[in-house]
């Protein structure tokens, strides 16, 4: 006999990285017929939704109008059909950005390199932080962590045309509070013609949307819950 229901999906719209004082919606998708959803924050019950009519609804949304460091952290949700509860969702790490200062991102030997060259990014922030994050813009939101007193280095190793794209970095004051983003650095990797044609660039965010980390449905990421969860979890573990 089944003791629990399948876990729901949890994600944030427009993104799990939320500039302070901006809005975000936490979405929890369970099953049609669920009579109650519970959103938990840092292990404690945060909010409850009892959708009506339950047989016509399989997703609820919890709106945060004004993101701040108190609202940043780990969220999960569960749902109930009759008296049977689901497994908890994966953890959603909600991050507040645009805190305090702006780091500087540089790249060595330079932003234009040849395939096979070793490339290292340097992220520098003079205020009190020891963790840095390097993000490559694009659908899969590649993220690397680095550590250092005022600067972290991110060696990419010998690069290929797949490394082409726009990078930014953040200083992290804790797992869920990040600095303003650095100015973008566009890495151009030239290779032979054949390699270039076989390695299309990730679709990047339009410049204006990256400014507020708005992932629109055009990127496809919101629709791909598994990828969304995977990206968010790997980022902060």
């Amino acid at each position: 006999q089944q003791q629990t229901l399948p876990k729901p999906f949890i994600w944030a719209e427009p993104h799990f990285m939320v500039p302070k004082e901006k809005q975000v919606t936490i979405c929890c998708q369970g099953n049609y017929g669920a009579v109650e959803y519970q959103l938990h924050f840092e292990g404690s019950l945060f909010a409850v939704d009892r959708p009506k009519p339950p047989e016509r609804i399989n997703k609820v949304q919890f709106y945060i109008p004004d993101m701040n460091s108190r609202m940043a952290g780990q969220y999960s949700c569960i749902y109930r059909v009759g008296e049977l509860w689901s497994e908890p969702s994966n953890l959603l790490d909600l991050v507040v950005t645009e805190m305090y200062d702006t780091p500087t991102l540089s790249v060595h030997p330079g932003p234009e390199v040849i395939s096979g060259e070793k490339v290292t990014f340097y992220c520098r922030l003079d205020t009190a932080t020891s963790m840095f994050l390097l993000l490559k813009e694009g659908r899969s939101s590649h993220v690397q962590r680095g550590y250092g007193k005022v600067q972290a280095e991110f060696p990419l190793g010998p690069v290929t045309t797949a490394h082409r794209g726009t990078y930014r970095c953040f200083g992290s004051y804790n797992n869920h509070a990040w600095s303003f983003p650095s100015e973008p650095v566009k890495l151009l990797v030239t290779g032979d013609i054949e390699n270039t044609s076989l390695a299309p660039e990730d679709p990047t965010f339009p410049a204006d949307t990256w400014g507020t980390y708005l992932l629109t449905t055009e990127t496809g990421l919101q629709k791909d819950h598994a990828l969304w969860d995977h990206t968010a979890q790997n980022l902060l573990r």
Epitope: F41, L45, P65
Partner: nanobody
Framework: QVQLVESGGGLVQAGDSLRLSCVAS????????MGWFRQAPGKEREFVAA????????YYADSVKGRFTISRDNAKNTVYLQMNSLKPEDTAVYYC????????????????????WGQGTQVTVSS
């Protein structure tokens, strides 16, 4: 912006009943989810009960379930907390809270969920 004013507190004996009221200013009361919290001396403020905008959803802390009832009258801009079978451990300052961003079927349980708070009304239950 909404202002919340609680009333109805007082000193009662264990086993007695009290009804707390919270009146909200403004014409948009029906768009707010409402909650009651309480804070005993030297303790954290804790969730008691909450009610959604249209009263479709109510939710209670385990410690008051079956004894307390939350209700609202949108025409009177008022939310109520009917407290029966009071116990000495119910002694606390009771606060009313409002959130303007909930859906019709949603309530908040965490303090950080709520935007607006009243000043509180004291409830003392003697044994």
């Amino acid at each position: 912006q909404v202002q919340l004013v609680e009333s109805g507190g007082g000193l009662v004996q264990a086993g007695d009943s009290l009804r707390l009221s919270c009146v909200a200013s403004g014409r948009t009361f029906s768009t707010y989810a409402m909650g009651w919290f309480r804070q005993a001396p030297g303790k954290e403020r804790e969730f008691v009960a909450a009610i959604s905008r249209n009263a479709d959803t109510t939710y209670y802390a385990d410690s008051v379930k079956g004894r307390f009832t939350i209700s609202r009258d949108n025409a009177k801009n008022t939310v109520y907390l009917q407290m029966n079978s009071l116990k000495p451990e119910d002694t606390a300052v009771y606060y009313c809270a409002a959130d303007r961003y909930s859906s019709n079927t949603q309530v908040g349980v965490a303090r950080t969920y709520y935007d607006y708070w009243g000043q509180g009304t004291q409830v003392t239950v003697s044994s």
